[in-house]
């Protein structure tokens, strides 16, 4: 059974959710990778991908997505800015390697957007939001549709578990052959 | 709880190096990067450059390419941090500090109680 | 280069409210965190995510976000909260700003 891990992130609407993804260096460098949406039932979809070949440090736009690839660092940079309630959800980052399927990169991020300022006692949400216009998309790149020969298993519940501390981790064991076919719309 | 011990106070001489260590502990030393950051006399915090404890990859700031040099041995969850051709400005006290998340590169929650490095002749 | 922009000095009466801007380029997509280096310590982290507090930091440390303006409040300013400050966010490299220090008067 592979164990997967997320992080959890709450944030208010109009922040920014800022997170890596670390890959193997010598091995995806150039890769095409991708943000994905995993929804309950359903297989996971493609939001943004970077260009074919992934382009250092090269900014991909998609709406309020905004990926960038640092190849001499090996990692994935994902932003989603002015954030909206309806962002929440569970995400990952996969790398695309046809003929095979798409590989996961650990961690996947759980992602809770709540309106507005937080107003009650002891809250650490102790500020108002930041609504930020973002600039005109600059690069879309194309991301691949990916068919898979064998059938999606459907993704993992929506943890229960309270994850209060931001070193907390949900830990979801005995999820085996998940399949990571990215979709459009 | 997480630990960060870094390695005892050093004086050098201008042209030599330094090593300082940062031992890890109370947490999967692997799952999270680990930054160097600086602080001379009278000035303000300066970030060296980060680990990735995991890869062995280092990504350092562009005014310490070239003479910093940053690994990790896992088998004993320590972090080092290596400054050569050290000059009187690179007198300092040096943290090292880790990521609040594995899936972040900032915020430092977590910091070394620093070294000092003196350089002089 | 990226830089982040602090005011070098802010003074406050005790019990009045301070407050410590840091502004850069595009600061309005990035994520940013505030620390506080008070002589012979090292830094700990006050605001993270603009306005999220860690745990065990006083209430009175707040932090907010308009345009690409970042700012720290420190409500009802206490003698030991004289420090120096700093403003982080993470560009291609991890930035700081040139530090504030905060004196209590």
């Known amino acids: 059974a592979t164990k997967l891990t997320e992080e959890k992130y709450e944030l208010k609407e109009g922040q920014t959710l800022d997170v890596k993804c670390d890959y193997t260096l010598e091995k995806f460098a150039s890769s095409q990778k991708a943000w994905q949406i995993i929804r309950d039932g359903e297989m996971p979809k493609t939001l943004a991908c970077t260009e074919r070949p992934s382009k250092n440090s090269h900014p991909v736009q998609v709406g309020r997505i905004i990926l960038e690839d640092y190849h001499d660092h090996g990692l994935l940079r994902v932003r989603m800015v002015n954030l909206q309630v309806e962002d929440s959800g569970l995400y990952q980052c996969v790398i695309y390697q046809p003929p095979k399927e798409p590989h996961m990169l650990f961690d996947r991020i759980r992602l809770v957007v709540t309106k507005g300022f937080s107003g009650t006692p002891g809250s650490n949400e102790n500020s108002t939001q930041n609504v930020y216009k973002i600039p005109p998309t600059t690069t879309k790149a194309l991301c691949p549709l990916y068919t898979s020969p064998r059938t999606v298993t459907q993704a993992p519940p929506k943890s229960t578990a309270d994850v209060s501390t931001p070193d907390s981790e949900i830990n979801l064991t005995n999820v085996t052959d998940i399949i990571r076919v990215p979709v459009f719309n | 709880q997480v630990q960060l011990v870094q390695s005892g106070a050093e004086v050098k001489k201008p042209g030599a190096s330094v090593k300082v260590s940062c031992k890890a502990s109370g947490y999967t030393f692997n799952g999270y990067y680990i930054h160097w950051v600086r602080q001379a006399p009278g000035q303000g915090l300066e970030w060296m450059g980060w680990?990735?404890?995991?890869?062995?990859?280092?990504n350092y700031a562009q005014k310490f390419q070239g003479w910093v040099t940053m690994t990790r041995d896992t088998s004993i969850s320590t972090a080092y941090m290596e400054l050569s051709r050290l000059t009187s400005d690179d007198t300092a006290v040096y943290y090292c500090?880790?990521?609040?998340?594995?899936?972040?590169?900032?915020?430092?929650?977590?910091w070394g109680q620093g070294t000092l490095v003196t350089v002089s002749s | 280069s990226y830089e982040l922009t602090q005011p070098p000095s802010v003074s406050v009466s005790p019990g009045q409210t301070a407050s410590i801007t840091c502004s850069g380029d595009?600061?309005?997509?990035?994520?940013v965190s505030w620390y506080q280096l008070k002589p012979g310590q090292s830094p700990i982290l006050v605001i993270y995510q603009d306005n999220k507090r860690p745990s065990g930091i006083p209430e009175r440390f707040s932090g907010s976000k308009s345009g690409n303006t970042a700012i720290l409040t420190i409500s009802g300013t206490q003698a030991m909260d004289e420090a120096d400050y700093y403003c982080?966010?993470?560009?291609?490299?991890?930035?700081f700003g040139g530090g504030t220090k905060l004196t209590v008067l």
């Open positions: 680990l990735n404890p995991n890869s062995g990859g280092a």
């Open positions: 595009k600061l309005g997509e990035r994520n």
């Open positions: 500090a880790r990521d609040q998340r594995k899936t972040t590169v900032t915020p430092f929650e977590y």
């Open positions: 982080q966010a993470w560009d291609r490299n991890v930035v």
